[in-house]
């Protein structure tokens, strides 16, 4: 893996120490020839959780264009999911305009959908 990236199974991961809105985070990953992390299994979930710690962190899952989609094209419906109870809920009550179209790890690792402009930390992933 590149310097400052962490290897696990067939992928390399980079864990941000700053925050960006979801679109900017994905753009950052793309500039590194990577993408926001696609969580494919419970084992991968635990690995990421361990490195991220108890902070909200963007992952590569969005429904900005309609249905929920992983950024690398991995099938969402048949794939691994770890939503918090009653999530995703596309909540409009935050007052920031629109619903919630981007997914993130919460402090306990469960996923939540949130407004994409919140400047959360993020995780990039690329193939080894």
């Amino acid at each position: 893996c590149p310097v400052n990236w962490v290897g696990y199974e067939g992928s390399c991961y980079w864990f941000s120490r700053s925050g960006k809105p979801w679109p900017e985070a994905e753009k950052y990953c793309q500039l590194e020839n990577a993408h926001l992390v696609v969580v494919g299994s419970w084992e991968e979930q635990k690995f990421i959780q361990h490195h991220v710690g108890p902070v909200n962190s963007w992952i590569g899952l969005t429904d900005q264009s309609g249905p929920w989609k992983w950024v690398d094209g991995t099938d969402y419906e048949s794939g691994f999911k770890n939503w918090r109870p009653e999530q995703p809920d596309d909540w409009y009550g935050h007052g920031l305009g629109g619903g919630e179209d981007c997914a993130h790890f919460t402090e306990d690792g469960g996923w939540n959908d949130d407004i994409c402009q919140r400047p959360y930390r993020w995780v990039c992933e690329t193939q080894r």
Partner: antibody, heavy 121, light 112 residues
Framework: QVQLVESGGGVVQPGRSLRLSCAAS????????MHWVRQAPGKGLEWVAI????????YYADSVKGRFTISRDNSKNTLYLQMSSLRAEDTAVYYC??????????????WGQGALVTVSS | DIVMTQTPLSLSVTPGQPASISCKSS???????????LYWYLQKPGQPPQLLIY???NRFSGVPDRFSGSGSGTDFTLKISRVEAEDVGIYYC?????????FGQGTRVEIK
């Protein structure tokens, strides 16, 4: 230690403009969301505006929307509040406040001492 | 907008005695991320507000352990186990789950 110092307050006539500044020190200013909160004399607290750490997003209370503009200059470690079309009900002490955590926390942990703005003819 | 309602609005307490302030929100403050976005601030006379409690029950750094917060959903309480002279001022609850951030009307605490 975290320091926030507001300046630019004073007496201004209704309909006129005023710009408040908040000089920040003791932390990495460019990593924190910043807010303005105001308090009318003898009244409670009212949140006014927030700006993201990099200035990319700004949100306002309905009472000031279209009249006030929050901005920041990260190279100068300074937060601003440009107030125009001022009304008597804008008379208040204006506090700048810093988000509790870098990038996003959604609440303020550090406050300046405040700048008094009096709108009167 | 979310309305925050505090009771009582004024409280006179004998030093060493407990005090309790209630705060009710017009909507649930539980976010999808599992956190509850409710905070308590104290404004001492002539000073800016200072953070006491974040996310319902977490004491901010340097806050004495006689202050505690509890509650969930829409009902919250700030307790002072033994009031001291330096605790006088106005206590505000605040929500930040929804913009605009909104505060309660404030509860004035004075010493008997």
């Amino acid at each position: 230690q975290v320091q926030l110092v507001e300046s630019g307050g004073g007496v201004v006539q209704p309909g006129r403009s005023l710009r408040l500044s908040c000089a920040a020190s003791g932390f990495t200013f460019s990593s924190y969301g910043m807010h303005w909160v105001r308090q009318a004399p003898g009244k409670g607290l009212e949140w006014v505006a927030i700006i993201w750490y990099d200035g990319s997003y700004k949100y306002y209370a309905d009472s000031v929307k279209g009249r006030f503009t929050i901005s920041r200059d990260n190279s100068k470690n300074t937060l601003y509040l440009q107030m125009s079309s001022l009304r008597a009900e804008d008379t208040a002490v204006y506090y700048c406040a810093r988000d509790a955590h870098d990038f996003w926390s959604g609440y303020f942990a550090y406050w300046g001492q405040g700048a008094l703005v009096t709108v009167s003819s | 907008d979310i309305v925050m309602t505090q009771t009582p609005l004024s409280l006179s307490v004998t030093p060493g005695q407990p005090a309790s302030i209630s705060c009710k929100s017009s909507q649930s403050l539980l976010h999808g991320d599992g956190k509850t976005y409710l905070y308590w601030y104290l404004q001492k006379p002539g000073q800016p507000p200072q953070l006491l409690i974040y996310e319902v029950s977490n004491r901010f750094s340097g806050v004495p352990d006689r202050f505690s917060g509890s509650g969930s959903g829409t009902d919250f309480t700030l307790k002072i186990s033994r009031v001291e002279a330096e605790d006088v001022g106005i206590y505000y609850c605040m929500q930040s789950i929804q913009i605009p951030w909104t505060f309660g009307q404030g509860t004035r605490v004075e010493i008997k």
